[in-house]
């Protein structure tokens, strides 16, 4: 049993880091493998992650972490029984994939304005709370070409757009994702989408 693709990990910079790797053949990850991880710090304890299958030869493990900060560094040991298959390290702050924003809501009761709001996925005491920027994707269910992205570079988790920038009388969907420049993160996953019917009074044309 050998590791074909070494583990690569990403952290949500809050409580979970996800590591993925590939073996050289079909593997029952949860019964044959264990990923041990330990913070390089005074008094830290070793923890064991039981991987799950991710395709025939792929494995994925969700590492639970407390109080993740930029100084943290973890040692990783991948074991098959008594055999050490791979040894490495992982610094969560250098491989951040933010959590997806939640509670996306479209407020259509403001005259001729659409207000989209969502929730910051981090608590106020987390460093990323004040450092997220967002991308909002709006698309038409009727017209695949009617697809647009709005970049929200301010901190407030909201976006106002004129209803008239979208077609009237048809249904739209929106979703939002986040990233943080400070840690050069990847984009988060998209939030669940929300749907609304866009209707507004078009100005009378002469």
């Amino acid at each position: 049993m050998k590791v074909l693709q070494e583990p690569t990990c990403v952290s949500d910079y809050m409580s979970i880091s996800t590591c993925e790797w590939k073996m050289n053949g079909p593997t029952n990850c949860s019964t044959e493998l264990r990923l041990l991880y330990q913070l390089v710090f005074l008094l830290s304890e070793a923890h064991t992650c039981i991987p799950e299958n991710n395709g025939g030869a792929g494995c994925v493990c969700h590492l639970l972490m407390d109080d993740v900060v930029s100084a943290d560094n973890y040692t990783l040991d991948l074991w098959a029984g008594q055999q050490l298959l791979w040894k490495g390290s992982f610094k969560p702050s250098e491989h951040v994939k933010p959590r997806a924003p939640g509670n996306l809501t479209v407020h259509t009761n403001v005259s001729d304005t659409l207000l989209l709001t969502w929730s910051n996925p981090y608590p106020p005491d987390n460093y990323l709370y004040n450092h997220l920027t967002y991308a909002v994707n709006i698309w038409s269910e009727n017209d695949p070409a009617d697809f647009r992205i709005y970049n929200v570079t301010y901190l407030e988790p909201s976006l106002r757009i004129a209803a008239s920038t979208l077609k009237s009388g048809i249904s739209y969907r929106a979703r939002v994702r986040a990233w943080a420049q400070c840690y050069n993160t990847t984009w988060s996953e998209w939030s669940p989408s929300t749907k609304w019917h866009n209707s507004y009074r078009e100005p009378f044309e002469q």
């Epitope: 710090f41 005074l42 008094l43 830290s44 304890e45 407390d66 109080d67 900060v69 930029s70 100084a71 943290d72 005491d125």
Partner: antibody, heavy 116, light 111 residues
Framework: QVQLVQSGAEVKKPGASVKVSCKAS????????MHWARQAPGQGLEWMGI????????SYAQKFQGRVTMTRDTSTSTVYMELSSLRSEDTAVYYC?????????WGKGTLVTVSS | QSVLTQPPSVSAAPGQKVTISCSGG????????VSWYQQLPGTAPKLLIY???KRPSGIPDRFSGSKSGTSATLAITGLQTGDEADYYC????????????FGTGTKLTVL
């Protein structure tokens, strides 16, 4: 919000022991390390040791080895620092502080006076 | 005896800028992360800067930290009378057992 509530001031005689408590609230107690530091009157901060509330393991500054004991009670989210063989130089304000590489939150401090 | 050296005192007028230095060595500041703590008279220390230059929520951007080699600096702009306090740098000594250490402390007087 996070609160670290420490026990009240103590007056002890040389050679005695003192046990200071620090009750935590407003966060997951076992998820954060707890440090102890002290500050003698008019002096700077001095680190004493650290406890991992999850397993109860400890590490102490070399200066206090053999004289200090840190424990925790997860049922009450409280950590304790006991210092024995007290001498006049141990007169100080003793602080508990939550954190790992840096100390996010501090208790208000407990004044321990050692006097014959 | 702290191995992190700070000036005993600094002073400046309201509205001015002041810097406080923290000098260490390769086994501490040079190899670890620096934090800064503010201790107002009669109160417990409070985290001001961590990870060399980051501010906890609620700390105004008048406070900033930097690190270069084996020394670190705390800068305070737009000084206010409420900033009058003792300031301590902190880091980890990695020479033997990993141990937190504090600087000697600096008394800031707002004139």
């Amino acid at each position: 919000q996070v609160q670290l509530v420490q026990s009240g001031a103590e007056v002890k005689k040389p050679g005695a022991s003192v046990k200071v408590s620090c009750k935590a609230s407003g966060y997951a107690f076992t998820s954060y390390y707890m440090h102890w530091a002290r500050q003698a009157p008019g002096q700077g901060l001095e680190w004493m040791g650290i406890i991992n509330p999850s397993g109860g393991s400890t590490s102490y500054a070399q200066k206090f080895q053999g004289r200090v004991t840190m424990t925790r009670d997860t049922s009450t989210s409280t950590v304790y620092m006991e210092l024995s063989s007290l001498r006049s130089e141990d007169t100080a304000v003793y602080y508990c502080a939550r954190g790992k590489w840096w100390l996010y939150d501090w208790g208000k401090g407990t004044l321990v006076t050692v006097s014959s | 005896q702290s191995v992190l050296t700070q000036p005993p005192s600094v002073s400046a007028a309201p509205g001015q800028k002041v810097t406080i230095s923290c000098s260490g060595g390769s086994s501490n500041i040079g190899n670890s992360y620096v934090s800064w703590y503010q201790q107002l008279p009669g109160t417990a220390p409070k985290l001001l800067i961590y990870d060399n230059n980051k501010r906890p929520s609620g700390i105004p951007d008048r406070f900033s930290g930097s690190k270069s080699g084996t020394s670190a600096t705390l800068a305070i702009t737009g000084l206010q009378t409420g900033d009058e306090a003792d300031y301590y740098c902190g880091t980890w000594d990695t020479s033997t057992v990993l141990t937190p250490i504090f600087g000697t402390g600096t008394k800031l007087t707002v004139l």
